[in-house]
Structure formats: C-alpha cells, structure tokens
C-alpha cells in the first residue's frame, strides 16, 4: 500500500482542517488508514482522524482543530496499521480556504434596485472577519450566456445593482463566495444559490 498523491490540507480557520490524498489503488480509507496530527508544542497529544473515501483511491479527513492560532504548526503522520506511509507538516494559517458565506437574500422591493445581502461566515473575534471580500455570481436560468461576476472589494456583505442591468421578465439566480486577499487564501466554495424573478418598469420614452 502506497501513497500516490501526498496529503494536501486546508483550514477553514474556524474549527476544521481538511486533508485529501490519493492511494495507489482502491482503498477502504476508514478501516485501513489513520491520519495522526499533533501541535508542535511540549506536552501536546496526537489526535487521530478517521478518513473517509473520496472516490476509489481517494481519501479525505476532517481534522478537528478548535484551538489554532496563526503561528501554529502541526505534524501529520499517515498510518496503515503499524506502517508509516507518509510524514509531513501543516501550518493552518498558511493554507486557508474560508467558509462559504450564508443567508444570501435578494431584496427586490427597493425601487428599481436589487439589493443582495449575505452573512459573513465568521464571528467578529475571528481573524478573517474583517478581511473577507466577495464575488457575487448572477446568471440567467434561461440564457447560459447571461452570466456575470461582481467583485465586492469592500467589507460590507452586500451588493446593489440596478435591476435594469438584467433582463426583465425572467428568472435569475445568484450565489456568493469569499476570500481574504491579504492572507492569500483560496476562494471559499459558493454559497447555496437563491432565485428571483427580475422585473422592473421600463423607462417611458418620449418622442
């Protein structure tokens, strides 16, 4: 039994780090493998993560890390029974994938403006709370070419757009994701999408 693709890990910088790797053949990850992780501190104990299958030869492990700070380093040991398959290290603060924003809502009752709001996925005392910026994706269910991205580079989790920038009388969907540019995080997953029917008054044309 060998590791084909070494574990790569990302932290949600809140409570969970996720490690994924591939074995050289079909593997029952939960029965055959264990991933041990340990904070590089005196007296710290190793914690055990039981991996799950992620495709035939792929494994994924969700490491509970409820006490992590920016300077922390962890050792990672991947075991198959008594055999050490791989040894590595992981600094959560250098491999951050933010949580997806939540509660995306489209407010259509503000004259001819669409107001999209969502929630920051972190509590105010979290390091990422004041550092997230967002991308909002809006697309038409009827026309695959009608697909747009709005970059929200300010901290407020909201976006205003004129309803008239979208076609009237058809349904649209929106979703939002987050990243923290200054800490070189990856993008979060997209939030669940929300749907609305876009309608607005066409401006009266005078001839």
């Amino acid at each position: 039994m060998k590791v084909l693709q070494e574990p790569t890990c990302v932290s949600d910088y809140m409570s969970i780090s996720t490690c994924e790797w591939k074995m050289n053949g079909p593997t029952n990850c939960s029965t055959e493998l264990r991933l041990l992780y340990q904070l590089v501190f005196l007296l710290s104990e190793a914690h055990t993560c039981i991996p799950e299958n992620n495709g035939g030869a792929g494994c994924v492990c969700h490491l509970l890390m409820d006490d992590v700070v920016s300077a922390d380093n962890y050792t990672l040991d991947l075991w198959a029974g008594q055999q050490l398959l791989w040894k590595g290290s992981f600094k959560p603060s250098e491999h951050v994938k933010p949580r997806a924003p939540g509660n995306l809502t489209v407010h259509t009752n503000v004259s001819d403006t669409l107001l999209l709001t969502w929630s920051n996925p972190y509590p105010p005392d979290n390091y990422l709370y004041n550092h997230l910026t967002y991308a909002v994706n809006i697309w038409s269910e009827n026309d695959p070419a009608d697909f747009r991205i709005y970059n929200v580079t300010y901290l407020e989790p909201s976006l205003r757009i004129a309803a008239s920038t979208l076609k009237s009388g058809i349904s649209y969907r929106a979703r939002v994701r987050a990243w923290a540019q200054c800490y070189n995080t990856t993008w979060s997953e997209w939030s669940p999408s929300t749907k609305w029917h876009n309608s607005y008054r066409e401006p009266f044309e005078q001839h």
């Epitope: 904070l39 501190f41 005196l42 007296l43 104990e45 700070v69 920016s70 300077a71 603060s93």
Partner: antibody, heavy 121, light 107 residues
C-alpha cells in the same frame, strides 16, 4: 470587564526559584491560550511562554532563553495562569506581564499591569 | 527567529503633528502584526491588530498599513495622551517577537 492581575514578583538571589501568578476575570478563561511576556529595564518586550487550552492537552511553548528553566501552567477553575521560574539569572530581571490569545483570533488584546522581578546577589 | 526592526527609536514631535513609525520583518509574517502602546506608568494597550485593524475604543487618528515586509503606524494629529512608547509585534511564527520600540516625546 476583562482584567488580568499579575503577582509574585520580588527580589531573589541568582539560582533561586519563584512562582508568578496571573489571576483573570471578565472572560471565559478556559477558551483562551495564555502567555507570559517580560520587559527588562529600559529594553524591548520579550515573549517567553504560552500554554494552550484543554483540547490541546495544555501544551506549552517557550522562548529559547527560558526553555528548561521556566514552566507555564494554568488552573481553569481559578481562571489563573502561573509561571514557575527556576535557576534564576540576573538577566531574568524584568517586569513580567500576562496576556491572552483567542483561537483563530489576534493575541494580546488585554494586558496585566505587570509584576517586577529582580534577580541580584 | 523573525527580527522586527523598528524605526525611529525615538521621535520628538509637536501637538497636532502627523507622525509615522515603521517596522520591517526579516521574514514573511503575512500581516500578523500588532502595534502596542506603553504609557510611562508601564500599562500596555493594543492599538492595531492584523496590520491595519483598529482595536475598539482606539481613536481614529491611529491607523496601520502594510507595504510588503514594511508595516507602519501613523498618528494623523498628535494629542497629549499619545506621547508614549510604541512597539510592533509579529505573531505569524514562534517565538513571537517585538520591535525595539519607539519613544515618542513632546517637542
């Protein structure tokens, strides 16, 4: 409101031992890592030790200058953190401060007023 | 260890003046930097964390910024209570390390 109060400083001879205490209030102590820092007279601040929370088995980390001589410990039931100092040297003379750090947060938002240790023969 | 080089080591300035202090990190610290104020009586207060985020209750005349490995604290208009010692702190790697401090004195 958040308070941290250090006690236990004093005058000791080189080679002797002393234990400092930091009693806290106004926050959920068990959720925070706790640190000791010090400042020798007229010099910069220096970080010396940290202790983690229960889920990390109260693991500790130390500056090289105190490793093997100082030991940090905590008592969550008393919302207190301690610094046991052995084989003290004259260069350990400083004002000692405690501070706190939240997981996934930013350290040292509150500080104690400090307690002064003088190591001299 | 990461060295934090702070400048200037001392600064004389007048009330209402704008001043800037700088810290340079010897290695990448990814914005994990705070600015602390120490009053003459020894009390320490955090002003800025994450390089640029102002602590609650800190006057808006204080601001923090980053340019590569250089980090700055700016006081836009000095007031009498601002005359104190200032330290930068990196907390991106153990051991956490401080700059040498800047003594801000009244001119």
């Amino acid at each position: 409101q958040v308070q941290l109060v250090e006690t236990g400083g004093g005058l000791v001879r080189p080679g002797n031992s002393l234990k400092l205490s930091c009693v806290t209030s106004g926050f959920t102590f068990s959720n925070y890592r706790m640190h000791w820092l010090r400042q020798p007279p007229g010099k910069r601040l220096e970080w010396i030790a940290v202790i983690t929370v229960k889920s990390n088995n109260y693991g500790a980390n130390y500056a090289e200058s105190v490793k093997g001589r100082f030991a940090i410990s905590r008592d969550d039931s008393k919302s207190s953190v301690y610094l046991e100092m052995n084989r003290l040297r004259e260069e350990d003379t400083a004002t000692y401060f405690c501070s706190r750090e939240r997981a996934y947060g930013n350290p040292f938002d509150y500080w104690g007023q400090g307690t002064t240790l003088t190591v001299s023969s | 260890d990461i060295q934090m080089t702070q400048s200037p080591s001392s600064l004389s300035a007048s009330l209402g003046e704008r001043v800037s202090l700088t810290c340079r990190a010897s290695q990448e610290i990814s914005g994990y930097l705070s600015w602390l104020q120490q009053k003459p009586d020894g009390t320490i207060k955090r002003l800025i964390y994450a390089a640029s985020t102002l602590d609650s209750g800190v006057p808006k005349r204080f601001s923090g910024s980053r340019s590569g490995s250089d980090y700055s604290l700016t006081i836009s208009s000095l007031e009498s209570e601002d005359f104190a010692d200032y330290y930068c702190l990196q907390y991106g790697s153990y051991p956490y390390t401080f700059g040498g401090g800047t003594k801000l004195e009244i001119k």
